[in-house]
């Protein structure tokens, strides 16, 4: 029949789960630049992957348009809080698209972890969660920011991360 | 034509939502055991199933290769706080694999809930979820840890849960 | 061959992602009630979408039946808390089935946030993230609620919101 | 075998000062907080305030704030309340007890109680 | 603060016999299933006894004659059967909110 090509295409992407765009990127000792920039991500060791979509400067940039379920986790800690700090973390995800200058706010949370110091100690952890669908065009990014960054616990890139798949 | 049989698998698998491999497991009476372990969980009744994934012992197990979406939530809670108790509470995935001895970090939260009690009352709550994209291999395992795990309040299976679905 | 209709149309899904299901709906000034209902969400503009779902008075109905991953977060705030609040504020989705005259709990948090303000400020924010996989058959719905619902933050449907998509 | 072992009965005039002591031992010192009560002659328990023995942070029922000061020593498992401008109205037992998370906050173990009596 | 409601403040039951106890608390003092009760057990010169936790746990080495139950606002203390040694009196504490507050004590005397 004439369906060959295709037909091979088509069991071959069944197979492979279709390649659906996937990412996981991990929190690394470079992610935080103080730059008042986006977090940057490591995208090949350890638990870091790409599959069918591109990383540049700390943003995943879809290759293939669509809806796509985007996460993050952020790790905060600390012992007290800086001072001036307000009382507000943000952690959000944005979207970079050529065809407007600004980031797009997509999902975005704050809260004030500072006054979760236990009775044992100034010592405090919180921890923050996005995840949603949202619809990229191909060549349109998204970036992790946090403010403040100084508040960002790293280790071994587990605790915080970003990542995304297609829906 | 020749693709016959195989047609007529992608057309099923295709009305089947491809069988994709997903799952979502419950908090039940059973899942503290107090003995260091992981948490174990409901996998039939009520809003608890598996489809495409196995399960053992606490963990779900990946019976075809392929990134996976796996996400764990759980309802902490207390009157007070033990002393003794780091001012953490670690929630968090962790993998199993033939290929090396011990569990391996995927995904973790650390936490400090117990500063948290409003004006007079010591109750407090707090929940703490996860979720990233993981690459398991056939076999390979995924467990739930909470250290301290006195502090998960267990209910009827909305507020701690544990589940996968692949991307 | 006799399969040129279904050829086209699994090719067809193919290039479309399958149609599969999908929806991000965002918080609006008219989610929050005050009537003991859900919230409620906007559908269209900005970030918002519904594909292969619809949307009644608050809920996500599901036009297919299958394992859908349902999310939503929502932004808690407030200066101090309201008196006579108890410490707990619960943030669940819920289902609604012809076959069931009551709500069904689904994926539930409870949080006491209002202890959370840092020692300069009585302000306080905190976020509340459920996601999980449930079953839906067609034209059962999922809504969102919160109580104390006085304390979620709309803004610009960034840090409130809910959705889902087949899995 | 856990001990809370209290310091002996006080004689003090009224305007002075008096600190108890309790001793501890039998169990990690660090590990539960310590909790002070007052039992007035023939009457009931008043629950006074606690200390965190691991940094010393005191929480104090609010009638008994500008009362009592307390204070731990890590070295030596001891716990100790300060008692300050003393009136016949702080005559009483003072007892302190060991606070038990994993049984609801409740008092398990219980020091055999110091006498304080204030008199001119 | 949370007013612990004690009565009988005094009873006198037989040997062998049940002793009730009953303990109202002004509001609930309950947390996810537990009720956050405590009951104790005083001797004239002596410190008070541990004898329930959590509104219905047995602390180690209390005799099972002794129980207890309630949940909410309302709990009672249970001895039964009634020995010699019982005789004492017993507080109820909620341990659920500051301050930690007591019944004003109910004296159980034997027959």
């Known amino acids: 029949d004439g369906h060959g090509g295709s037909w091979e295409q088509l069991i071959q992407e069944r197979r492979s789960h279709q390649n659906n765009p996937a990412a996981h990127l991990t929190g690394a000792n470079s992610s935080l630049t103080g730059s008042g920039g986006p977090l940057l991500w490591e995208t090949q060791l350890g638990l870091a992957f790409l599959r069918g979509l591109d990383y540049h400067d700390g943003a995943l940039v879809a290759n293939k348009a669509g809806y796509y379920y985007i996460y993050s986790k952020v790790q905060l800690g600390g012992v007290g809080c800086p001072l001036g700090l307000a009382s507000t973390i943000t952690h959000g995800l944005y979207k970079r698209t050529p065809r407007y200058p600004e980031e797009l706010e997509l999902l975005v949370s704050q809260q004030s972890p500072c006054g979760r110091a236990t009775s044992n100690s100034r010592v405090w952890w919180d921890s923050s969660f996005l995840g949603g669908v949202v619809h990229l065009e191909v060549g349109e990014e998204v970036v992790v920011r946090v403010l403040d960054e100084r508040l960002v616990r790293l280790r071994d890139g587990t605790r915080s991360y970003f990542g995304a798949f297609m829906v | 034509d020749g693709h016959g049989g195989s047609w007529e698998q992608l057309i099923q698998e295709r009305r089947s939502h491809q069988n994709n491999p997903a799952a979502h497991l419950t908090g039940a009476n059973s899942s503290l055991t107090g003995s260091g372990g992981p948490l174990l969980w409901e996998t039939q009744l009520g809003l608890a199933f598996l489809r495409g994934l196995d399960y053992h012992d606490g963990a779900l197990v990946a019976n075809k290769a392929g990134y996976y979406y796996i996400y764990s939530k759980v309802q902490l809670g207390g009157v007070g706080c033990p002393l003794g108790l780091a001012s953490t509470i670690t929630h968090g995935l962790y993998k199993r694999t033939p290929r090396y001895p011990e569990e391996l970090e995927l995904l973790v939260s650390q936490q400090s809930p117990c500063g948290r009690a409003t004006s007079n009352s010591r109750v407090w709550w707090d929940s703490s979820f996860l979720g990233g994209v993981v690459h398991l291999e056939v076999g390979e395992e995924v467990v739930v840890r909470v250290l301290d795990e006195r502090l998960v309040r267990l209910r009827d299976g909305t507020r701690s849960y544990f589940g996968a679905f692949m991307v | 061959d006799g399969h040129g209709g279904s050829w086209e149309q699994l090719i067809q899904e193919r290039r479309s992602h399958q149609n599969n299901p999908a929806a991000h709906l965002t918080g609006a000034n008219s989610s929050l009630t005050g009537s003991g209902g859900p919230l409620l969400w906007e559908t269209q503009l900005g970030l918002a979408f519904l594909r292969g779902l619809d949307y009644h008075d608050g809920a996500l109905v599901a036009n297919k039946a299958g394992y859908y991953y349902i999310y939503s977060k929502v932004q808690l705030g407030g200066v101090g808390c309201p008196l006579g609040l108890a410490s707990t504020i619960t943030h669940g989705l819920y289902k609604r089935t012809p076959r069931y005259p009551e709500e069904l709990e689904l994926l539930v948090s409870q949080q006491s946030p209002c202890g959370r303000a840092t020692s300069n400020s009585r302000v306080w924010w905190d976020s509340s993230f459920l996601g999980g996989v449930v079953h839906l058959e067609v034209g059962e719905e999922v809504v969102v609620r919160v109580l104390d619902e006085r304390l979620v933050r709309l803004r610009d449907g960034t840090r409130s919101y809910f959705g889902a998509f087949m899995v | 075998e856990v001990k809370l072992e209290e310091s002996g009965a006080e004689l003090v005039k009224p305007g002075a000062s008096v600190r108890l002591s309790c001793k501890t031992s039998?169990?990690?010192?660090?590990?539960?907080?310590v909790y002070w009560v007052k039992q007035r002659p023939g009457q009931g328990l008043e629950w006074i305030g606690e200390?965190?023995?691991?940094?010393?942070?005191?929480n104090f029922n609010e009638k008994f704030k500008s009362k009592a000061t307390l204070t731990v020593d890590k070295s030596s498992s001891t716990a100790y309340m300060h008692l300050s401008s003393l009136t016949s109205e702080d005559s009483a037992v003072y007892y302190c007890?060991?606070?038990?998370?994993?049984?609801?906050?409740?008092?398990?173990?219980w020091g055999q109680g110091t006498s304080v009596t204030v008199s001119s | 603060d949370i007013v612990m409601t004690q009565s009988p403040a005094s009873l006198a039951v037989s040997l062998g016999q049940r002793a009730t106890i009953s303990c109202k608390a002004s509001?609930?003092?309950?947390?996810?299933?537990?009720?956050?009760m405590n009951w104790y057990q005083q001797k004239p010169g002596q410190p008070p006894k541990l004898l329930i936790y959590?509104?219905?746990h047995l602390d180690s080495g209390i005799p099972a004659r002794f129980s207890a139950s309630g949940s909410g606002t309302d709990f009672t203390l249970n001895i039964h059967p009634v020995e010699e040694e019982d005789a004492a009196t017993y507080y109820c504490?909620?341990?659920?909110?500051?301050?930690?507050?007591f019944g004003s004590g109910t004296k159980l005397e034997i027959k």
């Open positions: 007890t060991r606070s038990n998370w994993d049984y609801g906050n409740a008092m398990d173990f």
């Open positions: 039998g169990y990690t010192f660090t590990n539960y907080y």
């Open positions: 200390i965190n023995p691991t940094n010393g942070d005191p």
């Open positions: 509001q609930s003092v309950d947390f996810d299933g537990d009720g956050y």
């Open positions: 959590k509104a219905s």
């Open positions: 504490q909620q341990s659920i909110e500051d301050p930690f507050t």
